[in-house]
Amino acid sequence: TPEVWVQVRMEATELSSFTIRCGFLGSGSISLVTVSWGGPNGAGGTTLAVLHPERGIRQWAPARQARWETQSSISLILEGSGASSPCANTTFCCKFASFPEGSWEACGSLPPSSDPGLSA
């Protein structure tokens, strides 16, 4: 069964800046990746970025840079300032859509530790 992993890290240099990394563990080819915060995209979450392997990347503030790392993983950097900036307990979710298999999603947040780290 395919799985999705999510890692959230707070940048040491900019403590209000976040990096979200997500990956798809499965054999299907990815058609679309949606990154949201505040919960899954279908349950009240707000879309931060949509990445399509052919048609490009769309992103919305406070997303600063979304990119493909590999054919099955992506990363997203969030701006750390402004009213819409994330806080330490914000949940980030990634949804990978693969045709014709379907969609898989997972969520993660910053680890409880005050140090920058990872959350699977």
């Epitope: 080819s29 058609s31 899954p40 399509h52 859509a97 014709p100 379907g102 969609s103």
Partner: antibody
Framework: EVQLVESGGGLVKPGGSLRLSCAAS????????MSWVRQAPGKGLELVSA????????YYLDTVKGRFTISRDIAKNSLYLQMNSLRAEDTAVYYC?????????????WGQGTLVTVSS | DIVMTQSPDSLAVSLGERATINCKAS??????VAWYQQKPGQPPKLLIY???HRFTGVPDRFSGSGSGTDFTLTISSLQAEDVAVYFC?????????FGQGTKLEIK
């Protein structure tokens, strides 16, 4: 304007074969996933087969596996469904449909359909 | 397989009145739910995708809502041209599945 035009339907005896075609125009055919959906007389909709834009990943309804083959010819902007060992229960209108990644794989455009009747 | 169950099977509503069609999934389908309208002798037409987004050219009297397993298509003020069969559809997990359809008529 997006257009999908099916052909190839007709009356065939049980055990016979048909090849359905769907001529696509008005969009970049190679960039979209495509499907065949059927509707038996007075009944609901059933996804029969689907093919990824990469032409590698495919889906078949359990009851047609081993009998039907989906394919496409990018040069001719055409989708095909080769139907072998036809049964009475395959009688239906067969629709060609396009899937839109950005719409959660919803089928945003459909052809008018072609009627397949399997009867002795 | 994910089973999509629509209710009611048929519905009669007066012109100008509200029509509501429900769709229940046998398991969570995230937001990957679409609604289609099919008139006699015609192919289905996409009305709503991602639960609540109207497709190009669809009148704003059509709206979709819901999450998880329960979804609703609402026509705020029924028009004569809305007489049709309506299908919900999930594209969250293969195999994609449809509801059995709801026949909407004028009372």
């Amino acid at each position: 304007e997006v257009q999908l035009v099916e052909s190839g339907g007709g009356l065939v005896k049980p055990g016979g074969s048909l090849r359905l075609s769907c001529a696509a125009s008005g969009f970049t055919f190679s960039s979209y996933h495509m499907s065949w959906v059927r509707q038996a007389p007075g009944k609901g909709l059933e996804l029969v087969s689907a093919i990824n834009s990469n032409d590698i990943n495919t889906y078949y309804l359990d009851t047609v596996k081993g009998r039907f083959t989906i394919s496409r010819d990018i040069a001719k902007n055409s989708l095909y469904l080769q139907m072998n060992s036809l049964r009475a229960e395959d009688t239906a209108v067969y629709y060609c449909a396009r899937h839109e990644d950005y719409y959660g794989f919803a089928m945003d455009y459909w052809g008018q359909g072609t009627l397949v009747t399997v009867s002795s | 397989d994910i089973v999509m169950t629509q209710s009611p099977d048929s519905l009669a509503v007066s012109l100008g009145e509200r029509a509501t069609i429900n769709c229940k999934a046998s398991q969570s389908v995230s937001n990957d739910v679409a609604w289609y309208q099919q008139k006699p002798g015609q192919p289905p037409k996409l009305l709503i995708y991602y639960v609540s987004h109207r497709f190009t050219g669809v009148p704003d009297r059509f709206s979709g809502s819901g999450s998880g397993t329960d979804f609703t298509l609402t026509i705020s003020s029924l028009q004569a041209e809305d007489v049709a069969v309506y299908f919900c559809h999930q594209a969250y997990r293969s195999p994609w599945t449809f509801g059995q359809g709801t026949k909407l008529e004028i009372k």
